[in-house]
Interface confidence: medium
């Protein structure tokens, strides 16, 4: 229903704490370079204004849209042009164009240093002195680095952060308590960030219909006992919520997400038998729990999918009379029977089914033509199954680091024009799929692997779009979202690439590598590996193994030496010479 004052309505629905958190996230995602202090000042001003509107909805400016209010605040920032250049041009526009302009200037790879976690003692001190400010900094730092992070979910992670600090800061060994717990929150949050970016990409590039199809498949897998109309209602709501968050309408998004959780908990009987535990939790935890809910049990007596979609003599009539309903029902029925498939695979199958009907229903004998359609799904199903099998076997053989290196070599050969930092980031993330998915039971592996890889490859596409350098990557990224992963998997060594000249300085290392944390050490080595492949794209696995083994020994030896600097200075050139020889 329409409210006199949108901002008052959201403030009342969300409560002051969540309202402030969401406004902070919104500002941090739009203006990613501004310091925390500047944003928090704006947040306080917006909050004070919202309170005046709660007290009197007819007060001046209270009837303005939230985009107008937020945009006016951002555009009033002094030195906006100095800090943000052409983003300041957005301020000359009217809503809704101004907001669209802000969205287009969101930077997926802002030039910000990696978020460094302070020492445990220092962290606990600042948390205990001012928990609100501490968590505010967390929201700000994550939001500015991930401008599409799902805002209500980020509030949930801040709550988790709060819980961990509250618990661990009273322990005698704070670091031992904090490190594993915060690492787990960070890992989950980073995965959430790439998943949400994929959802926003889907919405931006292919529109609501494509996103809704994704949601229907996902909901059908989770809630196989819910009927199609229920699934569609949930998918429609989830689509609206994601559209709002991707579009910067964070207050509305969070409010609608809470509403959806309420609806699901009030309608458990028609949705799923697994919801009760989630429904007893407070709002942020409830929504998160519902988003991560395990699949309900599949009904025992489901008939064969062929009955309605192959054997029924009215298939073409049903398809012609109500295409979306018919195809939507097919996707629902297939998905609820296959929690063991990835959403991407289910959407590929639905697309194949649609293409078959388009072709066959125009022919003389449609049933004979579409009669084999389910058998024709087989190669589409086998391809990702083989991908999972071979990659999990490789992961089990090499471990995470070794598997990341294998992926790095593979992807550098596929797209050697892509910048080394982007390749290393992508390979490290792709390589984590092993740890994340290969240890799961067989039935959960495929959905875990393929949907995770799709999200990581979307990140690669988003970064590549900013500075396109590889035609092959552009081709895979321009096609349909569900075909991306198979497209990348099918890429081979780029024969058009002219190998990079060998530059000794690329492979020159200093004693500072010795004091780096393990992760940073790995990144240094992986950077060298990518550069080697760019120099010799057709190097064999054995050649690369030799050079990298040599390199690891060299670092290990010099880091143990009494005079580290001298060791690096003298042994380094020898290593470069041996490497060149090994790769000749």
């Amino acid at each position: 229903e329409a409210h006199k004052s949108e901002i008052a309505h959201r403030f009342k629905d969300l409560g002051e704490q969540h309202f402030k958190g969401l406004v902070l996230i919104a500002f941090s995602q739009y203006l990613q370079k501004c310091p925390y202090e500047e944003h928090i000042k704006l947040v306080q001003e917006v909050t004070d204004f919202a309170k005046t509107c709660v007290a009197d909805e007819n007060a001046e400016n209270c009837d303005k849209s939230i985009h107008t209010l937020f945009g006016d605040k951002l555009c009033a920032i002094p030195k906006l042009r100095d800090n943000y250049g052409e983003l300041a041009d957005c301020c000359a526009k009217q809503e809704p164009e101004r907001n669209e302009c802000f969205l287009q200037h969101k930077d997926d790879n802002p030039n910000l240093p990696p978020f460094q976690r302070p020492e445990a003692e220092a962290m606990c001190t600042s948390f205990q002195e001012n928990p609100t400010s501490f968590l505010g900094h967390y929201l700000h730092e994550v939001a500015r680095r991930h401008p599409y992070f799902y805002a209500p979910e980020l509030l949930y992670y801040a709550e988790k952060y709060n819980e961990v600090l509250t618990q661990c800061c009273t322990e005698s060994d704070k670091a031992a308590c904090l490190t594993p717990k915060l690492d787990a929150v960070k890992e989950k949050a980073l995965v959430a960030a790439v998943r949400q970016r994929m959802k926003c990409s889907s919405m931006q590039r292919f529109g609501e219909r494509a996103f809704k199809a994704w949601a229907v498949a996902r909901m059908s897998q989770r809630f196989p006992n819910a009927e199609f109309a229920e699934i569609t209602k949930l998918a429609t709501d989830v689509t609206k919520i994601n559209k709002e968050c991707c579009h910067g309408d964070l207050l509305e998004c969070a409010d609608d997400r809470a509403e959806l959780a309420k609806y699901m908990c009030e309608n458990q009987a028609t949705i799923s038998s697994k919801l009760q535990a989630c429904c007893d939790k407070p709002v942020l935890q409830k929504s998160q729990c519902l988003a991560e809910i395990e699949h309900d049990n599949i009904p025992a007596d489901l008939p064969s999918i062929a009955a309605d979609f192959v054997e029924d003599k009215e298939v073409c009539k049903n398809y012609a009379e109500a295409k979306d309903v018919f195809l939507g029902t097919f996707l629902y029925e297939y998905s609820r029977r296959h929690p063991d498939y990835s959403v991407s695979l289910l959407l590929r199958l639905a697309k194949k089914y649609e293409a078959t009907l388009e072709k066959c229903c125009a022919e003389g004998d449609p049933p004979a033509c579409y009669g084999t359609v389910l058998a024709e799904f087989q190669p589409l199903v086998e391809e990702p199954k083989n991908l999972v099998k071979t990659n999990c076997e490789l992961y089990e053989k090499l471990g995470e680091y070794g598997f990341q290196n294998a992926v790095l070599v593979r992807y550098t050969q596929k797209a050697p024009q892509v910048s080394t930092p982007t390749l290393v980031e992508a390979a490290r993330n792709l390589g984590r799929v092993g740890t994340k998915c290969c240890t799961l039971p067989e039935a959960q592996r495929l959905p875990c692997v393929e949907d995770y890889l799709s999200a990581i490859l979307n990140r690669l596409c988003v970064l590549h779009e900013k500075t396109p350098v590889s035609e092959k990557v552009t081709k895979c990224c321009s096609g349909s979202l569900v075909e991306r992963r198979p497209c990348f998997s099918a890429l081979t060594v780029d024969e058009t690439y002219v190998p990079k000249e060998f530059k000794a300085e690329t492979f020159t290392f200093h004693s500072d590598i010795c004091t780096l944390p393990d992760k940073e050490k790995q990144i240094k080595k992986q950077t060298a590996l990518a550069e080697l492949v760019k120099h010799k794209p057709k190097a064999t696995e054995d050649q690369l193994k030799t050079v990298m083994g040599d390199f690891a020994q060299f670092v290990d030896k010099c880091c143990k030496a009494a005079d580290k600097d001298n060791c690096f200075a003298t042994e380094g050139p020898n290593l470069v010479a041996r490497s060149k020889e090994a790769l000749a």
Partner: nanobody, 116 residues
Framework: QVKLEESGGGLVQAGGSLRLSCVGP????????MGWYRQAPGKERELVAF???????NYNDAVQGRFTISRDNAKNTVYLQMNALKPEDTAVYYC??????????WGQGTQVTVSS
Amino acid sequence: QVKLEESGGGLVQAGGSLRLSCVGPGFLLRSNTMGWYRQAPGKERELVAFIRPSGLTNYNDAVQGRFTISRDNAKNTVYLQMNALKPEDTAVYYCHTRPPFQRDSWGQGTQVTVSS
């Protein structure tokens, strides 16, 4: 637009029985809640009964114990068995579903007249 077709209506004495049938696309009937509604002259359309894909049924208090809704998936049909009919059951009976992505699908209706 999805098409639903009702049949089985007619004129019957109070206390008598009728069985209404609704035929529609199998994929729709199996995946969605199907309902029977009725509209008496000069009155609002009201829900009589519905059946979920799981087989779960629900009835208007006025017909509880007298009417039975069922489905035959092999025949793509939903039935409404009406026993102990009363004059106040006189109405046009409509078969209904709400397929997602579309407006509600209604049949053309079948007239039931109960004389006293």
